[in-house]
């Protein structure tokens, strides 16, 4: 399975929407900065079978969807932008699920790399814990928005490799 060109476009649109979602200057939130420990090694893609890379990307997008579809998120971000954001994430999840289905039986390796998926979950668990500790403050959400934008940018490299991989 090769991810369609529309998947890359959707990823770029997702980043644009997240950029538009910013409401306060990041510079006013410098004291709230936090290292969430983005698992870069899970997105390098060199050691991956294709199906496993797809499952890791799927988990990251699913967790992003979960994070931004809470009532605390809805109270923070512009509703129109959030709806657009959900649409793009949903499109990407569908693309990856379609790809996953095609990969079943193609590779001898398991479809899901559970260990890699759990590493992604731990990363998102840290983000949700941070938001809880900061009582979902505007600056905390701003820090998280910037972090998710960064993680999407970093994962885009893996998506691009998947799209080109024969």
């Amino acid at each position: 399975c090769d991810l369609p060109q529309t998947h890359s476009l959707s990823n770029r649109r997702t980043l644009m929407i997240m950029a538009q979602m910013g409401r306060i200057s990041p510079f006013s939130c410098l004291k709230d900065r936090h290292d969430f420990g983005f698992p870069q090694e899970e997105f390098d893609g060199n050691q991956f079978q294709k199906a496993q890379a797809i499952s890791v990307l799927h988990e990251m997008i699913q967790q992003t969807f979960n994070l931004f579809s809470t009532k605390d998120s809805s109270a923070t971000w512009d509703e129109t932008l959030l709806d657009k954001f959900y649409t793009e994430l949903y499109q990407q999840l569908n693309d990856l699920e379609a790809c996953m289905m095609q990969e079943v039986g193609v590779e001898d390796t398991p479809l899901m790399n559970v260990d890699s998926i759990l590493t992604v979950r731990k990363y998102f668990q840290r983000i949700t814990l941070y938001l809880t500790e900061k009582k979902y403050s505007p600056c905390a959400w701003e820090v998280v928005r910037a972090e998710i934008m960064r993680s999407f940018s970093l994962s885009a490299n893996l998506q691009e490799r998947l799209r080109r991989k024969e």
Epitope: G37, P39, Q63, N66, D115, L118, T119, R121, F124, L129
Partner: antibody, heavy 122, light 107 residues
Framework: EVQLVQAGAEVKAPGESLRISCKVS????????ISWVRQIPGKGLEWMVK????????IYNPSFQGHVSISVDKSITTVYLQWSSLQASDTAIYYC???????????????WGQGTLVAVSS | DIQMTQSPSSLSASVGDSVTITCRAS??????FHWYRQKPGKAPELLIY???NLQTGVPSRFTGSGSGTECTLTITSLQPDDFATYYC?????????FGQGTKLDVR
Amino acid sequence: EVQLVQAGAEVKAPGESLRISCKVSGYTFTSYWISWVRQIPGKGLEWMVKIDPRDSYTIYNPSFQGHVSISVDKSITTVYLQWSSLQASDTAIYYCVRHYLTQSLVDYFDHWGQGTLVAVSS
Amino acid sequence: DIQMTQSPSSLSASVGDSVTITCRASQSVSNYFHWYRQKPGKAPELLIYSASNLQTGVPSRFTGSGSGTECTLTITSLQPDDFATYYCQQTHGYPFTFGQGTKLDVR
């Protein structure tokens, strides 16, 4: 097969230091949280602390913070629990546990070590 | 801290009986309830996670239900192996907390 193998029993005097270990095998060490749980003989279970072996990020139960410390050695897939000055009240069985994390980010303890008995007595 | 209160603290039953243990949380923990069994001299073992999901390898005579502030563990057709102490746990908020335990012994 997932295994968490703990060191044997320890008998110590109050004020002494101690480090107990939990050697894990059978899975990717850096992908799962590890916690320590205390059980005072004949009593219930108390969660103490958890660590992400990937980068040693830790979360402590405030009741134990400052009295114990958790650490990992990735090269030998081992987690440690350490005291710098033991008290008689530290007498207990200590279990290391592996966390599983569901998609909705619910932690639960899916594998337990066999426990290490620590006896602190003068 | 979220307090977890189990009832009863102890109960007696016979092989083949059914028993129910209840756990109440001092505030809502959603479905972040888990149940463990501890046999004498052994480490606890996971039975049920996320209130109602049976851990792999655990017999179907164990069932969990509930969410919010209350959950229950039901054991049908008790086996000799089931006479042990049962603990509920919440992982919704830090610090994670356990119930005080329910000791199930032979009548």
